[in-house]
């Protein structure tokens, strides 16, 4: 019998509101034997997988998208799904990305730290749009090709 | 990479069909597969697609009509009682990477014919 | 249900020329939207997808662009090969716009 696989949860580094110019790193979090992360946004027909998954915890297991320059179009809300032979999960609850024009420039700290959204309540949307999608100039740290779209 | 369907052939209406999407050269499990149809002389016709994670969907006038379902490997699409009208070429197709609005991967289609 | 109004139905054009070609959808859909380029007895070949993005192997003379509902394609320095039944395509399959073809458009070149 197949497991019950857990809802994975997303979290962004350094924080969910990050001024114009400035590096995001969303996180997806699942248990361990990922083969695949993939990361989502809502009303975008664009998406991004990584198999750079790597051991979070002895119970977890995570992969890196970043961005390295943040512009207005990376606004929005982000959620992850993942693959664990032989099926995909439920998809992770939505995090909203909040992109902030500021005089303090790219290294300003000026983020709100820690936010996440975990395996809680299923997401309010229809959860069967199971792709409602991911990212202009997303990579997954270290191997993901940067994508562009107009 | 590639997909090619297959099962198309001569039947008669009420005579239940399935017709198989087979993928080569990628892993299946990342992808939408949609079928498609073309009426000789016709546009193409939009029937459904079985997602990357496991979902159906169906255009409204296909459902009750067929049934997609999907392997590691393969995806099928059942006609459940053809009429003549569904006499067409049946094609599968993939979309690319990184963007599930485009199919750039199609097979070369598959024939089926609805006929007494 | 989604509907896609694609626009004219047949359009002729000399070489060199340009060819507008529109599909109106009946509703929001973002960027889930391609369009298709099909000879006889040939598959569908994708030319744009996410609304504006030129597929791969595709020539900057196909255009893409998005307004609101109005999605248009335009070929321009219309070339012989380009003879062919185009479509518009929206294919989110996850319920929140839906799918389907527009009707097709045949471009002529004379």
């Known amino acids: 019998q197949e497991e019950d696989l857990p809802r994975p949860s997303i979290s962004a580094e350094p924080g969910t509101v990050i001024p114009l110019g400035s590096h995001v790193t969303f996180v997806c979090r699942g248990p361990v034997g990922v083969q695949t992360f993939r990361l989502e946004r809502e009303s975008r027909s664009t998406y991004n997988d990584t198999e750079d998954v790597s051991q979070a915890s002895p119970s977890e297991s995570e992969a890196r998208f970043r961005i390295d320059s943040v512009s207005e179009g990376n606004a929005g809300p982000y959620r992850c799904i993942y693959y664990k032979p032989p099926k995909w999960s439920e998809q992770s609850d939505y995090l909203e990305l909040l992109v902030k024009e500021t005089s303090g420039g790219p290294d300003s700290p000026d983020t709100e730290p820690g936010s996440s959204a975990g395996p809680t309540q299923r997401p309010s949307d229809n959860s069967h749009n199971e792709h409602a999608p991911a990212s202009q100039g997303l990579k997954a740290e270290h191997l993901y090709h940067h994508h562009h779209h107009h | 990479a590639a997909v090619k369907e297959s099962g198309g052939r001569l039947v008669t209406p009420g005579t239940p069909l399935t017709l198989t999407c087979t993928a080569s050269?990628?892993?299946?499990?990342?992808?939408?597969i949609q079928w498609v149809r073309q009426a000789p002389g016709k546009g193409l016709e939009y029937i459904g697609a079985?997602?990357?994670?496991?979902y159906t969907y169906y255009a409204s006038w296909a459902k009750g009509r067929v049934t997609i379902s999907r392997t590691s490997t393969t995806v099928d699409l059942k006609m459940t009682s053809p009429t003549t009208e569904d006499t067409a070429t049946y094609f599968c197709?993939?979309?690319?990477?990184?963007?599930?609005?485009?199919?750039?991967?199609w097979g070369p289609g598959t024939l089926v014919t609805v006929s007494s | 249900e989604l509907v896609l109004t694609q626009t004219p139905a047949s359009v002729s054009a000399a070489v060199g020329g340009t060819v507008t070609i529109k599909c109106q959808a009946s509703?929001?859909?973002?960027?889930?939207f391609a369009w298709y380029q099909q000879k006889p007895g040939q598959s569908p070949k994708l030319l744009i997808y996410?609304?504006?993005n030129l597929a791969s192997g595709v020539s900057s003379r196909f255009k893409g662009i998005r307004s609101g509902t109005e999605y248009t394609l335009t070929i321009s320095d219309l070339e012989c090969a380009d003879a062919a039944t185009y479509y518009c395509?929206?294919?989110?399959?996850?319920?929140?716009?839906?799918?389907?073809f527009g009707g097709g458009t045949e471009v002529e070149i004379n």
């Open positions: 197709a993939r979309h690319i990477d990184g963007d599930y609005s485009g199919y750039a991967l």
């Open positions: 050269g990628f892993s299946l499990y990342k992808y939408n």
């Open positions: 079985s997602t990357y994670a496991g």
């Open positions: 509703q929001s859909i973002g960027t889930w």
């Open positions: 996410g609304a504006s």
């Open positions: 395509q929206c294919s989110d399959v996850g319920n929140t716009y839906g799918a389907a």
